[in-house]
């Protein structure tokens, strides 16, 4: 399906295309000799980059900082220095830059202020950079000032104190709404979440906090959960992790109804050295992965129903550090149903999984052809791809990226791997899919850093290297062929690939800085490759391409969660621009329901090998531990629940006995009866 | 074939620090792998003393953390061994070796043939 | 720390008889142990890991048996130059910790 990569070869050669890459190269060099830099991008499709410098000198009683602030408007090609729109202050960089939600154009920055201060001191910008006000705030900021996803206007702050501090009007006046606070949250609806301690701080009431909520603003409040050790949202589920009466396990609850009512998760609980963690969700379902007793630096991930309530066994030691908190848990957004992780084997082997269908079967990624089993495969003619993410990075192992995937580049994984029985410590190459990770081909030779520019009509890489660097590569088909570009004749020490989050622009920021003997100046270049790809892409460049097609002569070839979906796909011997405007188009079709379109419900189970569901032995005529608030006709099953975001119609409908099982329900959860609401005086 | 070689002084006075340098040849350092020291007291058993990755991250044994840095120099395709305020209990045979090729474990596949280092004043 | 016991620590065995050598862990090491083989004045050579699994060029005498906390090294029929000191070593948990050795001697 694919070769072997090949470099400046008569692979596809581009025809001039270094004096066309020559003629769109900027270089930027900043009068600075900061330590350190960091960049953001501000709005979509705007061009505005904010470039923050800081230069920190330790003396022995106070730290001198100086910032400097730079503005772009042209994707990186030009920079201006600013800083005298923040009347040259030092920023603190542990806060970052907080950038608006959307295209609202709006930027904070937090600055230093001296010790004896009454608060803190913020610049705030609402025309994406252009111009700054210095507001000074009543309390000293813990964490970054925290937008609400539906109004750009308000925001929320912790203070040093623990207060919840909330702002309606961009961060020009602030309220205090609460006091002893530990975590605060959005919600929807511009929803305050937040959990309070009651008698002596937030480490010490761990497991006693209180659950608060607030729908306007800090006027009224409602006590939506007690004995709570934390929350967290995640899709349209909130989840509690809550104390038990009895002793010091914990256990989640579940609420669809932001804290109405709360139903307990049917998954085991917890004890005190465990945790929960919520690996990823969506308004359809959550990947929830359960801690294993003990320090083995794996658990269990669990799959959830429509309810986030009921929850399948999905994989098996699943490596997550309770050190670091490392997992590998990796969801592949340019294929629906695809995520990569990695499970701790018994001999502390770790070894790359896949699933394609949202965790309901995982298996190891195939072998990329032509591909040899390194050292760690025992048969050298059997073995597997494994990858390399945050473990591996965690691990100072040479890998300079985690897996890079993007919505708008259909089918395309980029990733660091070994192929063998295991993840190896030899130094890995790059390794690409174009169909979302069925297939996989070595893509470069060695660690990379790498980007997806035009929705992935370029795919561009730098090498990682210790030595300076002044070349980049660059492919125009999904990583076959590549050439190389000499960007700069001075070799710059490589600090970061910078491109618009979205991965549609055509501009790649190469970032880095020259050292002589005494000075470090900071550099970047910035390439565009619209000239590379001269032409907009027509109708005649692109092909269909069934998503997750395993077996072509099958009617169900293509039907993952109970649809197919086509794709139009750019070839790879097309060389033209899809376009900032680019929309992936995708032919969905509905396919015919089976019993794999179905989890089993509440009380439920499918024996190992079977596809029928039945009833648990152990709950015949008993009562069940997990339960569900709210109406009753919740609590009828026939056994079978659709799996949630399954579209599947016709077909196989499994009918069975309607059974009422609100006789078999127990639970001592907060009852929405004791909820009390509250009115902030 | 890999082949590895311990050097340095063999003979150290007390509270002063032992220095071993480990050259490898035959394959290069920064292509990865881990790479240990283990040492062993004159008619005693192996005890392992700690292990690094070519990027520089370590693992000590806990026994010896406060003592010990191990260092890798990927230029010279060699890795090194600093252990301070010897006494003469870390009078031993020192050996450098290669670790396995998965992430996670850590036994010795490949053995430098030891150099002995004697502590006495 | 994991203590690996290995016992016996002396074992006399006469050529092309059967060598069984024991190691014991104070926690389960699952099968995250190693075999190693040490002659006078040598460094040690590497027979087993994974509990099992010979490594390259190990003659096919040798093998390794167990998990968790019982661990067996066979060596089905002895050779001259199987006369040695053999450590088992676990790398299930740091510290790496090695056994104190068998020493098997001619009878």
């Known amino acids: 399906r694919r070769g072997a990569p090949a470099e400046d070869q008569d692979c596809g050669r581009l025809p001039d295309f270094i004096a066309k890459l020559t003629n769109n190269t900027h270089q930027h060099v900043f009068d600075d000799l900061s330590g350190s830099v960091s960049l953001s991008w501000v709005g979509d499709s705007t061009g505005v980059i904010l470039v923050l410098t800081t230069f920190q000198v330790p003396l022995v009683i106070v730290s001198f900082g100086q910032s400097k602030l730079y503005r772009s408007e042209d994707y990186g090609k030009n920079f201006k220095d600013i800083t005298n729109l923040i009347n040259n202050t030092f920023i603190r960089t542990e806060f970052g830059m907080a950038i608006g939600p959307e295209n609202s154009g709006k930027v904070i920055l937090t600055a230093e202020v001296s010790g004896g201060s009454r608060g803190g001191r913020v610049f705030r910008s609402s025309d994406f950079a252009k111009n700054f006000v210095q507001t000074d705030l009543p309390f000293h900021p813990l964490t970054q000032m925290m937008y609400s996803p539906q109004n750009s206007d308000y925001l929320l702050a912790l203070s040093t104190e623990n207060g919840l501090w909330v702002s309606k009007n961009f961060g020009e006046k602030w309220e205090e709404i609460h006091k002893a606070v530990c975590l605060a949250k959005w919600g929807p609806n511009n929803i305050i979440f937040f959990t309070t301690h009651v008698n002596g701080s937030c480490k010490a009431d761990l497991g006693a906090l209180e659950l608060w909520r607030t729908s306007d603003l800090g006027k009224t409040f409602k006590t939506i959960g007690v004995k709570i050790y934390s929350f967290g949202l995640g899709g349209r589920f909130l989840f509690a992790s809550v104390m038990a009466d009895k002793d010091t396990t914990r256990r989640i609850h579940v609420s669809t109804d932001q804290g109405d009512t709360w139903s307990m998760a049917q998954l085991p609980s917890v004890g005190q050295e465990q945790f929960y963690s919520i690996l990823a969700a969506n308004e359809d379902m959550v990947f929830m992965h359960v801690d294993e007793p003990g320090d083995t630096g794996f658990g269990t991930i669990f799959t959830s129903d429509d309810r986030g309530i009921v929850y399948s066994k999905s994989l098996d030691r699943h490596l997550y550090t309770t050190t670091g908190g490392e997992t590998d848990f990796t969801n592949v957004t340019s294929l629906r149903g695809v995520y990569i992780t990695s499970t701790l084997s018994e001999d502390n082997s770790i070894q790359s999984m896949i699933t394609f269908d949202q965790g309901g079967r995982w298996e190891h990624l195939r072998k990329p052809e032509n591909s040899k089993c390194d050292a760690t495969a025992k048969n050298k003619n059997e073995c597997s791809l494994h990858i390399h993410a945050s473990y591996s990075i965690s691990q100072k192992l040479n890998v300079p990226m985690a897996p890079l995937s993007e919505p708008n580049a259909v089918g395309i994984v980029i990733a660091h791997g070994s192929v063998g029985d295991a993840i190896s410590v030899m130094v890995p190459d790059v390794y690409i899919s174009d169909d979302g990770g069925y297939s996989w081909a070595k893509m470069l030779e060695g660690p990379h850093y790498y980007t997806i520019l035009d929705s992935g009509g370029i795919i561009v890489a730098i090498e990682h290297s210790n030595r300076p660097i002044n070349v980049i590569k660059f492919s125009t088909d999904e990583g076959q062929c590549w050439q190389s570009y000499v960007f700069t004749q001075e070799p710059i020490y490589f600090t970061g690939l910078a491109s618009e989050p979205g991965a549609r622009s055509m501009n790649i920021s190469i970032w880095g800085f020259t050292e002589s003997f005494i000075t470090r100046q900071w550099v970047s270049y910035t390439v565009d490759f619209k000239d590379i790809l001269e032409r907009n892409c027509e109708e005649d460049d692109y092909t269909t391409w069934l998503a997750h097609s395993t077996d072509p002569g099958d009617y169900k070839d293509g039907c993952i969660l109970g649809y197919k979906e086509q794709f139009l796909r750019l070839r790879k011997s097309s060389v033209c621009q899809n376009g900032r405007d680019y929309v992936v188009a995708k032919q969905p079709s509905v396919c015919p329901c089976s019993l794999e379109d179905f989890l089993c419900d509440f009380g439920y189970f499918r024996p190992e090998n079977a596809s029928e569901c039945v009833e648990q032995p152990e709950l015949k005529g008993h009562e069940l531990e997990f339960c569900l608030y709210g109406k009753e006709e919740h609590l009828t099953t026939n056994g079978y629940r659709k799996i949630p975001g399954d579209k599947c119609q016709g077909g196989m409908n499994p009918a069975r006995e309607v059974k009422d099982l609100k006789k078999k329900c127990t639970s001592n959860f907060l009852n929405p009866t004791k909820q009390n609401s509250k009115s902030n005086s | 074939q890999v082949q590895l070689q311990e050097s340095g002084p063999g003979l150290v006075k007390p509270s002063e620090t032992l220095s071993l340098t480990c050259a490898v040849s035959?394959?290069?350092?920064?292509?990865?792998?881990?790479w240990g020291w283990i040492r062993q007291p004159p008619g005693k058993g192996l005890e392992w003393i700690g292990s690094?990755?070519?990027?520089?991250?370590?693992y000590y044994n806990p026994s010896l953390k406060s003592r010990v840095t191990i260092s890798v120099d990927t230029s010279k395709n060699q890795f090194s061994l600093k252990l301070s305020s010897v006494t003469a209990a870390d009078t031993a045979v020192y050996y450098c070796?290669?670790?396995?090729?998965?992430?996670?474990?850590?036994?010795?596949?490949?053995w430098g043939q030891g150099t002995l280092v004697t502590v006495s004043s | 720390e994991i203590v690996l016991t290995q016992s016996p620590a002396t074992l006399s065995v006469s050529p092309g008889e059967r060598a069984t050598l024991s190691c014991r862990a104070s926690?389960?090491?699952?099968?995250?142990l190693a075999w190693y083989q040490q002659k006078p004045g040598q460094a040690p050579r590497l027979l087993i890991y994974?509990?099992?699994t010979r490594a390259t060029g190990i003659p096919a005498r040798f093998s390794g048996s167990g998990s968790g906390t019982e661990f067996t090294l066979t060596i089905s029929s002895l050779q001259s130059e199987d006369f040695a000191v053999y450590y088992c070593q676990q790398d299930r948990k740091g510290p790496l910790t090695f056994g104190g050795g068998t020493k098997v001697e001619i009878k």
């Open positions: 070796a290669r670790g396995p090729p998965e992430l996670g474990k850590m036994y010795f596949q490949h």
């Open positions: 926690q389960s090491v699952s099968s995250n």
């Open positions: 690094i990755y070519h990027s520089g991250n370590t």
């Open positions: 994974g509990a099992s």
């Open positions: 035959g394959y290069s350092i920064s292509s990865g792998y881990y």
